[in-house]
């Protein structure tokens, strides 16, 4: 089984703007359950100097807190280093800047290493279109359908968006 991992066409700048989280997956289910460290939702992204800047929404005490993160470029074109609940090897797996983005992270927190994947879309009304691609990427990295959580509007801090 071979294929090309798709990198952003025309540069990272095309990833700038609003995004919506649609689905999460992990080999450690606690990480993506409500109140899990990686039960977080993308709000927007921008790119500068090859680095990715993201605003994420984190559910906290019944509200959603916006937090800014930066994923720093590395020598590998689709890989970034991110500090969030430890160190993360963050990979852009599939990208269509106008439609959807699939990323996954190998997270190191204390002595534990975990795998987390995230599907985000530009237009929530089309989220079903991209779930098969997400399932396919998850399968490629050893995450199965029963390890995927599809988010609802209530889940993803919709009320906290500007």
């Amino acid at each position: 089984q071979e294929g090309n991992h798709e990198e952003p066409q025309g540069g990272l700048e095309e990833l700038s703007g609003r995004w919506h989280s649609v689905a999460l997956a992990s080999n450690k289910s606690d990480l993506i359950k409500p109140w899990g460290h990686f039960r977080v939702f993308i709000h927007s992204m921008s790119a500068k100097d090859g680095n990715l800047h993201g605003d994420i929404l984190i559910p906290q005490d019944g509200q959603c807190e916006k937090v800014s993160l930066t994923a720093f470029k590395t020598a590998t074109s689709n890989k970034f280093d991110l500090e969030y609940w430890g160190h993360n090897d963050l990979y852009l797996a599939e990208v269509d800047p106008k439609s959807y983005l699939i990323l996954y992270m190998i997270n190191q927190y204390n002595d534990d290493t975990s795998l987390v994947a995230h599907l985000m879309v530009r237009d929530l009304s089309r989220q079903q279109d991209f779930l098969p691609a997400f399932e396919s990427v998850c399968e490629d990295i050893g995450l199965h359908k029963d390890q995927i959580v599809v988010l609802s509007d209530d889940d993803r801090c919709q009320g906290s968006r500007d």
Partner: nanobody, 114 residues
Framework: EVQLVESGGGLVQPGGSLRLSCVVS????????MGWYRQAPGKQREMVAI???????NNVDSVNGRFTISRDNAKNTVYLQMNSLKPEDTAVYYC????????WGQGTQVTVSS
């Protein structure tokens, strides 16, 4: 193009040990997380162990304490030391370079049988 060449498999008795190796080319090895996966006949391919770019590791519960993943960045090689092997460990074992999720090597067959 990423290439992955696995070796070290074979036939071993229950309780025995094997050390698998995977040589990676076409990517910046030291920059990337790596993993070992396996696929038994009629089953889904499953993750066995992962190692981050900074060397931290994780094994799935079924092999914890028996299997150890490690890496040698100077040799572009990732290893899987498998001890106390059981018949249920019989599978084709594959390594993974996380920078290229769709690429797989040919795998190496591990058979645990008396």
């Amino acid at each position: 193009e990423v290439q992955l060449v696995e070796s070290g498999g074979g036939l071993v008795q229950p309780g025995g040990s094997l050390r698998l190796s995977c040589v990676v080319s076409g990517s910046i090895f030291s920059d990337n997380a790596m993993g070992w996966y396996r696929q038994a006949p009629g089953k889904q391919r499953e993750m066995v162990a992962i190692i981050s770019s900074v060397g931290t590791t994780n094994n799935v519960d079924s092999v914890n304490g028996r299997f150890t993943i490690s890496r040698d960045n100077a040799k572009n090689t990732v290893y899987l030391q498998m001890n106390s092997l059981k018949p249920e460990d019989t599978a084709v074992y594959y390594c993974k370079d996380f920078s290229a999720p769709r690429y797989w090597g040919q795998g190496t067959q591990v058979t645990v049988s008396s």
